[in-house]
Amino acid sequence: EEELQVIQPEKSVSVAAGDSATLNCTVSSLIPVGPIQWFRGAGPGRELIYNLKEGHFPRVTPVSDPTKRNNMDFSIRISNITPADAGTYYCVKFRKGSPDVELKSGAGTELSVRAKPSAPVVSGPAVRATAEHTVSFTCESHGFSPRDITLKWFKNGNELSDVQTNVDPAGKSVSYSIRSTARVVLTRRDVHSQVICEVAHVTLQGDPLRGTANLSEAIRVPPFLEVTQQSMRADNQVNVTCQVTKFYPQRLQLTWLENGNVSRTEMASALPENKDGTYNWTSWLLVNVSAHRDDVKLTCQVEHDGQPAVNKSFSVKVSAHPKEQGSNTAAENTGTNERNIY
């Protein structure tokens, strides 16, 4: 009699993650009597995928009714495929006995799973940095197959070149992950800047996946300070102004000191934004000159975003001959430099 054949017609089958895979298997004869089982892998470590007689295989269903008389089609359908299902599947005929004895195996069908990369997640530095400093952004995407993938970084539409990218694992795997780090040099104009991580893969329908991060989360723009005397009023009151300009973020506390003693403390809030995303703030202090015998040293002290305080001082001259109304006097800089980078 003709020897029984177990026919697996496809050497390989490729499916998209989430879809169903059909693994075909037919036998050439009904004799000898005995069950068919499906395994993933060969040898002693093989994994049972489907056995009609026993076991619970919720994702595996027979393509045709295996209980019908003279059935020779033992194809199966595996639903909701994941990359972990990749491997070579064997349809194996057993001879009925106690126990059943393996008689013949099909040639095997390799199941290849294509899976889309996850949406790229971009993370920035834990602490803010100032202009001219370099900060690192990281982009991660997971779960894709095959391994080939391209990742590009852009800042405001321009591709970045200071990039290091790794795809893991290096060897064969059911799915892969990509991690990339881009180094970006900050400028004072970067409050409104954005970095984009763009991932392209064969499974994506022509459109790369993008992850973004705003440089506003990573940058600190320290303020410029200027103290000026606006005018000497007829009632011997001097209006002194502290202009705090071009700073980001908005978190800022301003303290006025008169001869070293705290006069007033203010917190910045609800400030209008400049075109470049930075903020300006102006604080006024009225000084009653007639209440002082000596010159008054006024200090505008600014604490920005938890950084060490920056001071700008100004001496109001107490004189028998007050200055004409409307005159403007710039501050003497007895504090730190006007432009502070910390």
């Epitope: 998209a16 329908q205 022509g206």
Partner: antibody, heavy 116, light 109 residues
Framework: VQLVESGGRLVQPGTPLTLSCTVS????????MGWFRQAPGKGLEYIGI?????SPYYASWVNGRFTISKTSTTMDLKMNSLRSEDTATYFC?????????????WGPGTLVTVSS | DIQMTQSPSSLSASVGDRVTITCRAS??????LAWYQQKPGKAPKLLIY???FLYSGVPSRFSGSGSGTDFTLTISSLQPEDFATYYC???????????FGQGTKVEIK
């Protein structure tokens, strides 16, 4: 699932022409679509694709001469200033469900003849 | 751009013959290679994708192999309906561009 090209005809050199590919049985917003051409007695040549979101990409030789666009059910190929060497059958095709590396559904083609 | 070199450009064979067509890429395309069959006046038909995967409905006498730069299409036993022109097509995952081989015409001996 079906693709049908239209708009091919005899035109004079220097004339513009727009070809259309009408699809049925699937949504253009889910697949990459491509344009190809084949000069008489020659091989297949890739022109360009349009992504599922509508971004076009072109073969390097196109150099701005052709423009690919789409609506909900049609994909267009706008050809400027046609030359005699553009005489060919133009095919539209859809990529496979597993990825953009192959085209599994093709239209029958439409013939464009450029001659004075 | 990647160049695809297909050989032979034509071949004569008889029904029942085993036919092999090769395609070589100018640089690695991993397994991103498809094979198409085209008959005169008709659109191309997909046979093989990802170098070795048989497209649905294509007879099992067609098979593909190879990866990197060298690929093969094999027809194990040529049938009368197989006389046609065959094209390989690559996709490069970095440039995201497509290139076709120049074609192989399979004729009746």
């Amino acid at each position: 699932v079906q693709l049908v090209e239209s708009g091919g005809r005899l035109v004079q050199p220097g004339t513009p022409l727009t070809l259309s590919c009408t699809v049925s049985g699937f949504s253009l917003s889910s697949y990459v679509m491509g344009w190809f051409r084949q000069a008489p007695g020659k091989g297949l040549e890739y022109i360009g694709i349009i992504s599922s979101s509508g971004s076009p990409y072109y073969a390097s030789w196109v150099n701005g001469r052709f423009t690919i666009s789409k609506t909900s059910t049609t994909m267009d190929l706008k050809m400027n200033s046609l030359r005699s060497e553009d005489t060919a059958t133009y095919f539209c095709a859809r990529v496979g469900p597993l990825g953009v590396d192959y085209f599994n559904i093709w239209g029958p083609g439409t013939l464009v003849t450029v001659s004075s | 751009d990647i160049q695809m070199t297909q050989s032979p450009s034509s071949l004569s064979a008889s029904v029942g013959d085993r036919v092999t067509i090769t395609c070589r890429a100018s640089q690695s395309i991993n397994s991103y290679l498809a094979w198409y069959q085209q008959k005169p006046g008709k659109a191309p038909k997909l046979l093989i994708y990802s170098a070795s995967f048989l497209y649905s409905g294509v007879p099992s006498r067609f098979s593909g192999s190879g990866s990197g730069t060298d690929f093969t299409l094999t027809i194990s036993s040529l049938q009368p309906e197989d006389f046609a022109t065959y094209y390989c097509q690559s996709w490069h995952y970095i440039s995201r561009s497509y290139t076709f081989g120049q074609g192989t015409k399979v004729e009746i001996k």
